[in-house]
Amino acid sequence: MAVTACQGLGFVVSLIGIAGIIAATCMDQWSTQDLYNNPVTAVFNYQGLWRSCVRESSGFTECRGYFTLLGLPAMLQAVRALMIVGIVLGAIGLLVSIFALKCIRIGSMEDSAKANMTLTSGIMFIVSGLCAIAGVSVFANMLVTNFWMSTANMYTGMGGMVQTVQTRYTFGAALFVGWVAGGLTLIGGVMMCIACRGLAPEETNYKAVSYHASGHSVAYKPGGFKASTGFGSNTKNKKIYDGGARTEDEVQSYPSKHDYV
């Protein structure tokens, strides 16, 4: 039951995380105008991965897409790539994990197959979360660098009468959404990996049992050792004796009322 809960919770947490990564990638507020130096500005600038926007005090907002690919900074391209890879891996992970969920029965899928799928989706979620965190962190680092560069420029060449206030950008809401979402996806992935360990049939059950037939022939069907690798287990070829050493999840190998929560 604990494994099912861990797997289910891991799935839900990852789902929220990936939704957040998608939201962050689409958001326009990756960087927002720093108003510290000019709090009275009537024009507010903010930028995303795909377009930059200007909101006037009238409420009128004008957004312009980055219609060039080659003219964009390499770092921005890298951030885009990381976020897209994160989304793609997360989406595939979600698809795999749906079929891996213990509470969902698909044909005669074995526990070991579900364990493999759970582990695969878990790893995908971890990588997805790391991609998102890396993407957001690279962008944040880029902002910090540009912020201090523009601050340095702001106080040079001001000998004349005319002041030119350079627009500086600071962290936008999308960065925080991305960090949280990436973290959730990572946590969900770890939970899936933990759940995978509980789902895999225990190796020791088979290795510890030795048989000494006394008189009558004991019904023994070979094939149980396949499970020791964790791949290609055949639960149809189960030993009649297994020393009673079953895990909590093996007890629920067959459909019961608990499987359809």
Epitope: V43, S57, T167
Partner: antibody, heavy 119, light 113 residues
Framework: QVQLVQSGAEVKKPGASVKVSCKAS????????MHWVRQAPGQGLEWMGM????????NYAQKFQGRVTMTRDTSTSTVYMELSSLRSEDTAVYYC????????????WGQGTTVTVSS | DIQMTQSPSSLSASVGDRVTITCRSS????????????LTWYQQKPGKAPKLLIY???TRESGVPSRFSGSGSGTDFTLTISSLQPEDFATYYC?????????FGGGTKLEIK
């Protein structure tokens, strides 16, 4: 068509308050900022502040902070500008102007309200 | 506050003349986010409310004759009337639309020579 109709001329004594109204029609009242601009006799234009009729949020020029209050009544599509502690230099024509949607500039102006401050 | 300085304060010209009014701001009105200059030009006739002519430094308001044009960037702007018409004799104001308070220039009174 868009119309901004302001209240009539006022004569006030120094230290008193004046409340000028501006009734809007011909457009969605709650969608546009309303500005107040004044013009002293023979002088230039002076921006006083603005109010958003939907949220009621205001932005006043530092010069008028503490003396000016802008309010709105959405049921009658009217905005009000109240100026307190009147001085003789507050004698001016007060205009309300609708915020232009697409740029920051006001594009429709009221006919103006003459406020005379005299003892 | 941004100071707006208009020159000349008054100008005499004849019908058909080409007229240029300049406006200088104490701070740049160019927004880097969209590369637009937040400067507006108004025309005011005696006893009337101001009328919007040009916004974003060079965008003509609908219904404004093509003889009116705006140019400039950053801190220096100009309003040009290519061929003066009798109805163009009025006072012209530039306005900072970039930061609060939205300050106006002192005005340029255009009179008939």
């Amino acid at each position: 068509q868009v119309q901004l109709v302001q209240s009539g001329a006022e004569v006030k004594k120094p230290g008193a308050s004046v409340k000028v109204s501006c009734k809007a029609s011909g457009y969605t009242f709650t969608s546009y900022w309303m500005h107040w601009v004044r013009q002293a006799p023979g002088q230039g234009l002076e921006w006083m502040g603005m109010i958003h009729p939907n949220s009621g949020s205001t932005n006043y020029a530092q010069k008028f902070q503490g003396r000016v209050t802008m309010t709105r009544d959405t049921s009658t599509s009217t905005v009000y500008m109240e100026l307190s502690s009147l001085r003789s230099e507050d004698t001016a024509v007060y205009y309300c102007a609708r915020r232009y949607y697409g740029s920051i500039s006001p594009d429709y102006w009221g006919q103006g309200t003459t406020v005379t401050v005299s003892s | 506050d941004i100071q707006m300085t208009q020159s000349p304060s008054s100008l005499s010209a004849s019908v058909g003349d080409r007229v240029t009014i300049t406006c200088r701001s104490s701070q740049s009105l160019l927004n880097s986010g969209n590369q637009k200059n937040y400067l507006t030009w108004y025309q005011q006739k005696p006893g009337k409310a101001p009328k919007l002519l040009i916004y974003w430094a060079s965008t003509r308001e609908s219904g404004v004759p093509s003889r009116f044009s705006g140019s400039g960037s950053g801190t220096d702007f100009t309003l040009t009337i290519s061929s003066l018409q009798p109805e163009d004799f009025a006072t012209y104001y530039c306005q900072n639309d970039y930061s609060y308070p939205f300050t106006f220039g002192g005005g340029t009174k255009l009179e008939i020579k």
